[in-house]
């Protein structure tokens, strides 16, 4: 025998108190699948949370975080405080990045500036708390008399010595 409740669609529940009739989910509740014997209470996006998507009879509400915070975890289970660019969140709140580090986002940690010399390059633009350094050509390319952009050497045919 087929379970009569299996005929109840999403947005309804199988009401045992009414001979297993499919009843609509009450206000502020939902059922996302058919054949449910109860409806789930809608999530309420209050306090640090705000509503991104309203609850319907077939789907739960979705929350995000109020301005000044960003979501953490699946379904925005928690909110973390934003900081400004050039800062990171510490135990004592938002603090400026230390010299030699930067953060170009409102979240995350300060990261060290790129060390241009490791790639044999020079610093073209200095780093700030908000921005990484910009590496330029290698120091040898910037020696006196050398143009800042070295043109490619002309191709030589084999067996010809340079002039």
């Amino acid at each position: 025998l087929q379970d009569p409740c299996s005929n109840c669609p999403a947005g309804t529940f199988c009401d045992n108190n009414r001979n297993q009739i499919c009843s609509p989910c009450p206000p502020n509740s939902f059922s996302s699948a058919g054949g449910q014997r109860t409806c789930d209470i809608c999530r309420q996006c209050k306090g640090v949370f705000r509503t991104r998507k309203e609850c319907s009879s077939t789907s739960n509400a979705e929350c995000d975080c109020t301005p000044g915070f960003h979501c953490l975890g699946a379904g925005c289970s928690m909110c973390e405080q934003d900081c400004k660019q050039g800062q990171e969140l510490t135990k004592k709140g938002c603090k400026d990045c230390c010299f030699g580090t930067f953060n170009d986002q409102k979240r995350g940690i300060c990261r060290p500036w790129t060390n241009c010399s490791l790639d044999g390059k020079s610093v073209l633009v200095n780093g700030t708390k908000e921005r990484d350094v910009v590496c330029g050509p290698s120091p040898a390319d910037l020696s006196p008399g050398a143009s800042s952009v070295t043109p490619p050497a002309p191709a030589r045919e084999p067996g010809h010595s340079p002039q």
Partner: nanobody, 128 residues
């Protein structure tokens, strides 16, 4: 056994100050996000403030922003709520709550279902 014990409530005149404390035991305090929730007579619960396990993230309801300050001392397993410029509408029972999850060291929640443990509450009455 987990315990949250609030103290510091009492009767204060409008404009006055109080400092609530919540002493925690029976769990790893620094891993838990904490919150202060109040309930006035005949009204629903209101999340007043919350703080992450590390203390870095704090949240305040608009109704208390600029007047209340939440803090925690993880070495003493204690949560605090400094309440200044108190108003008659701050009269309520204040509860502390503790909840943990993957992000509870850095994040906060104002969803009551997130919180695993609740204290018994302390009464704050603001009246002249």
């Amino acid at each position: 056994e987990v315990q949250l014990v609030e103290s510091g409530g009492g009767l204060v005149q409008p404009g006055g100050s109080l400092r609530l404390s919540c002493a925690a035991s029976g769990f790893t305090f620094s891993s838990y996000a904490m919150g202060w929730v109040r309930q006035a007579p005949g009204k629903g619960r209101e999340f007043v403030s919350a703080i992450s396990g590390s203390g870095g993230t704090t949240y305040y309801a608009d109704s208390v922003k600029g007047r209340f300050t939440i803090s925690r001392d993880n070495s003493k397993n204690t949560l605090y709520l400094q309440m200044n410029s108190l108003r008659a509408e701050d009269t309520a029972v204040y509860y502390c709550a503790a909840g943990t999850g993957y992000y509870s060291r850095v994040g906060v929640s104002t969803d009551p279902s997130f919180y695993d443990y609740w204290g018994q509450g302390t009464q704050v009455t603001v009246s002249s």
